[in-house]
Interface confidence: low
């Protein structure tokens, strides 16, 4: 029976010292990675392609340059820093902000003006990917050209100027229905975030050929939900201290508990020239002992464990977070493929 | 000692029947999820916001519509189908295809023509997100306007026409350096993929004001890597049979092995109106017994286990794949946030 044979093996190997069994784990992991890569790329064998052919076929072109350049950015150097990606807290992707009351009376020429937007301190100017101001234009009676102008309120200048232009656009409207129009305000928003005191609000105008303003700025009856608003897309990669996570050890460690150990896979070392990038990557592996409730996989696991004693012969040292690698490779058919291979890097080990 | 107390607890609870401890697991999981959501969104308490205020504040606008509409698509119904996302094989994101020999002699007016592109059957027309033809334009000596024309070869028509236009563009070039120019060919590529027999190749022209062709189609000496090529971005969501994965059970199951059980979290049921979408989601949980090497987490784990017996008191039933949920919610500051909360859905359970 294969299973009992395996268990016997395990018992025999249990006599090895820590260094020996770590070495075994390491070489097994490298072999496993080679098998996985071919299997995950659905290749039966490694493509047979020479360095010369590669040099000849590789386009010297922007999209390829971009793909190769990404490898400088994407190396797994998280073990070197004290901060790591926070995969516990929510990541914010889009923030929709409604106009709000300004801290001062936002009136110009005796009339209230729209709009003033307050921003959460959470939004950092360098994290803004896209910022769109959405305005609703009321329907028109006849086909017409509409001149949309977004002005930024500024502190009055010597000549009395209260505004500076942000964006203006011209659009054709057909009768029958109002439309939502979006305007790029990323630069303005970034400036406001850098210098909050410069955010005095904006004015929106959308004049048709007869000078009528079609922009809904102060919604009338039946116009609920047609206020202007800001849609801000942000990249949110929160960090948190690595102390919140699993242990990291090095090859010389005497740590007996469950730990992540470094392991670099070098494709050139085993002659895989068909992989264009990366030439090597940090795969890592897990090794060590587990005590009950030591380093749970998810923050609430202890609750589940308390209620779920059966089937818990004791937790095991296993990857609790794995990440993919991006790979640029020849598939042996004069095609260069850029793809993502899942679960190739051990980011964290834990007892679960 | 807290640990021994916990172990004692575990032994007492071990006497419960399967249904009771599953029920305990389930209620613990719901409470844990509530705590997690607030904690992951960095909220101390649930925002106090009424349905009326929500109705009043929600913009009736395209970006919000899109975000809400996503919830129809994103429901976790994977348990209902026999195919599930394949998170083992590589996903292809970009394919760079070089011109190749046509199956027939691609000559027009006695001259060889560029270019013919062969496509892997792997590319499905409806998975193409972007397709760009990249051409390299040789440097010019003086500032000039270049007329780029991409023609598609077709079966000769009655009037002898051999071409139909795909794209034409006009661009200004300054002396000193050649440039890479990209042209959108998504529609043509999709047609070729739908009807491969219509793919007879293309002709590329890039004429300056004097009628000289600046496009590198057949690279001369020193022009290695300057061939035209196609850059195709695809969405690749390979599927594989759920049999390759962990077990799925229902509430009435008598399965004792490690299994995933359904659990729906209903935000409305506990009065969380501040969550705009989803109103409910399938969270699921893991429960059951583990035998050695039953349902390993990653395909190569058995190799590592053989070499790593220490600290493996036996594997445990734990989530081996978790996924995030996207959430649209009010943060209590007149802002609507669309974000991703990690590790909120148990997709698969296994012994690891």
């Amino acid at each position: 029976n294969e299973n009992s044979e395996q268990k016997e093996n395990v018992e025999k190997e249990g006599l090895c010292n820590a260094c020996t069994w770590r070495q075994n784990t390491k070489s097994s992991r490298i072999e496993a990675i080679k098998i996985q890569i071919l299997s995950k790329l659905r290749l039966e064998t490694a493509p047979n392609i020479s360095k010369d052919v590669i040099r000849q076929l590789l386009p010297k072109a922007p999209p390829l340059r971009e793909l190769i350049d990404q490898y400088d950015v994407q190396r797994d150097d998280s073990s070197d820093g004290s901060l790591e990606d926070d995969d516990y807290h929510a990541t914010t992707e889009t923030i929709i902000t409604m106009p709000t009351e300004s801290d001062f009376l936002m009136q110009v020429d005796g009339k209230p003006k729209c709009c003033f937007f307050k921003f959460s301190s959470k939004i950092q100017y360098n994290k803004v990917v896209k910022a769109q101001l959405w305005i609703y234009l009321r329907p028109v009676e006849t086909p017409t050209t509409v001149f949309v102008q977004i002005l930024r309120l500024i502190k009055p200048m010597k000549d009395g100027t209260r505004y500076t232009g942000i964006r203006s656009l011209k659009l054709d409207m057909n009768p029958g229905t109002g439309i939502w129009q979006s305007i790029d305000v990323k630069t303005v928003l970034q400036n406001w975030l850098k210098q909050p005191e410069s955010n005095l609000g904006i004015e929106i105008k959308a004049l048709d050929e007869n000078g009528h303003d079609l922009a809904v700025t102060f919604p009338g009856p039946g116009e609920d939900g047609l206020n202007p608003f800001l849609e801000v897309k942000v990249t949110d990669t929160p960090k948190r201290s690595r102390r919140d996570f699993g242990l990291d050890c090095d090859e010389h460690s005497t740590e007996s508990r469950c730990c992540r150990y470094p392991l670099t896979v070098d494709f050139e070392a085993f002659g895989w020239d068909w992989i264009i990038a990366p030439k090597r990557y940090k795969a890592n592996y897990c090794s060590g002992e587990c005590e009950f409730v030591f380093l749970q996989k998810y923050p609430h696991t202890h609750l589940v464990h308390q209620a779920n004693p059966r089937g818990s012969a004791g937790p095991c040292c296993t990857p609790t977070k794995m990440s993919p690698i991006n790979m640029l490779y020849f598939n042996g058919k004069e095609q260069i493929i850029y793809g993502k291979i899942p679960a190739m890097v051990v980011d964290r080990c834990g007892c679960s | 000692n807290e640990n021994s107390e916990q172990k004692e607890n575990v032994e007492k609870e071990g006497l419960c029947n399967a249904c009771t401890w599953r029920q305990n697991t389930k209620s613990s999981r719901i409470e844990a999820i509530k705590i997690q959501i607030l904690s992951k969104l960095r909220l101390e308490t649930a925002p106090n916001i009424s349905k009326d205020v929500i109705r009043q504040l929600l913009p009736k606008a395209p970006p919000l519509r899109e975000l809400i509409d996503q919830y129809d698509v994103q429901r976790d119904d994977s348990s209902d189908g026999s195919l599930e996302d394949d998170d083992y094989h590589a996903t292809t994101e970009t394919i760079i295809t070089m011109p190749t020999e046509s199956d027939f002699l691609m000559q027009v007016d006695g001259k060889p023509k560029c270019c013919f592109f062969k496509f892997s059957s792997k590319i499905q027309y409806n998975k193409v997100v972007k397709a760009q033809l990249w051409i390299y334009l040789r440097p010019v000596e003086t500032p000039t306007t270049v007329f780029v024309q991409i023609l598609r070869l077709i079966k000769p028509m009655k009037d002898g026409t051999r071409y139909t236009g795909i794209r034409s563009l006009k661009l200004d070039m300054n002396p000193g350096t050649g440039i890479w120019q990209s042209i959108d060919v998504k529609t043509v590529l999709q047609n070729w993929l739908k009807q491969p027999e219509s793919n007879l190749g293309i002709e590329i022209k890039a004429l300056d004001e004097n009628g000289h062709d600046l496009a590198v189609t057949f690279p001369g000496p020193g022009e290695d890597g300057l061939n035209p090529f196609l850059e195709v971005k695809v969405t690749d969501t390979p599927k594989r049979s759920r049999r390759d994965f962990g077990l799925d059970c229902d509430e009435h199951s008598t399965e004792s092995r490690c299994c995933r059980y359904p659990l729906t979290v209903d935000f409305e049921a506990f009065g969380w109106d501040w969550i705009i979408a989803p109103k409910r989601y399938k969270a699921n949980y893991c429960s059951g017994e583990c035998e050695f090497v039953f349902l390993q987490k990653y395909p190569h784990t058995h190799l590592v286990h053989q070499a790593n017996p220490r600290g493996s008191a036996g594997p445990c039933c734990t989530p081996t794949k978790m996924s995030p949920i996207n959430m649209l919610y009010f943060n209590g500051k007149e802002q609507i946030i669309y974000g991703k909360i990690p590790a909120m859905v148990v997709d698969r359970c296994g012994c690891s």
């Epitope: 329907p139 029958g176 | 009736k60």
Partner: antibody, heavy 119, light 110 residues
Framework: QVTLKESGPVLVKPTETLTLTCTVS????????ISWVRQAPGKGLEWVGI???????YKASWAKGRLTISKDTSKNQVVLTMTNMDPVDTATYYC?????????????WGQGTLVTVSS | DIVMTQSPATLSLSPGERATLSCTSS????????LSWFQQKPGQPPKLLIY???TLAYGVPSRFSGSGSGTDFTLTISSLQPEDAATYYC??????????FGQGTKVEIK
Amino acid sequence: QVTLKESGPVLVKPTETLTLTCTVSGIDLSHTDISWVRQAPGKGLEWVGIISYAGSKYKASWAKGRLTISKDTSKNQVVLTMTNMDPVDTATYYCARGVPAYSHGGDLWGQGTLVTVSS
Amino acid sequence: DIVMTQSPATLSLSPGERATLSCTSSQSVYHANWLSWFQQKPGQPPKLLIYWASTLAYGVPSRFSGSGSGTDFTLTISSLQPEDAATYYCAGGYGGGRYAFGQGTKVEIK
């Protein structure tokens, strides 16, 4: 409270002109389209016409030449006038907020008024 | 002229059953989604159920859902309730101020 109410004659003779009024409350006609829809007894709904918030008029093809729609924003009223009435025009006439088929138009209707065309 | 055809003319089902009503337009509605569904009970004005082909109107129970785009649309009532006995109309918009209703489907509860 937002309401729409149709009013006008209950009986009209053939060839005569029908005038119906839709009086709204809680609605600003300068920001709202108003539609007219009719329904013959035991039959389905039939679109008649629209006056847009800005005063543009759109009419069903069968009603062109016979139908006039106007509004008096200050009185909160929309008026439908249909000439050359025929017994086939016997129907319940409704006014509705917005345009049924566009966005959430048709989310509010009057109770309708039954108009009989008979000599 | 635009023709909107609803089928079936009458649908007779028991409580708890799933009802599927169809609406086909002779030409594509504007933006592929200018289509609404209305419910009408005798002696009452129509009530908006679905707009933009698939968006549930405010206050409408979630057992109602809409799907489709272009020329073919469906209204589904996942689990019929006695109060769902009514006539259901689709309404399409075609741009340029052109609108049309279907002839209606009567839903009866057995």
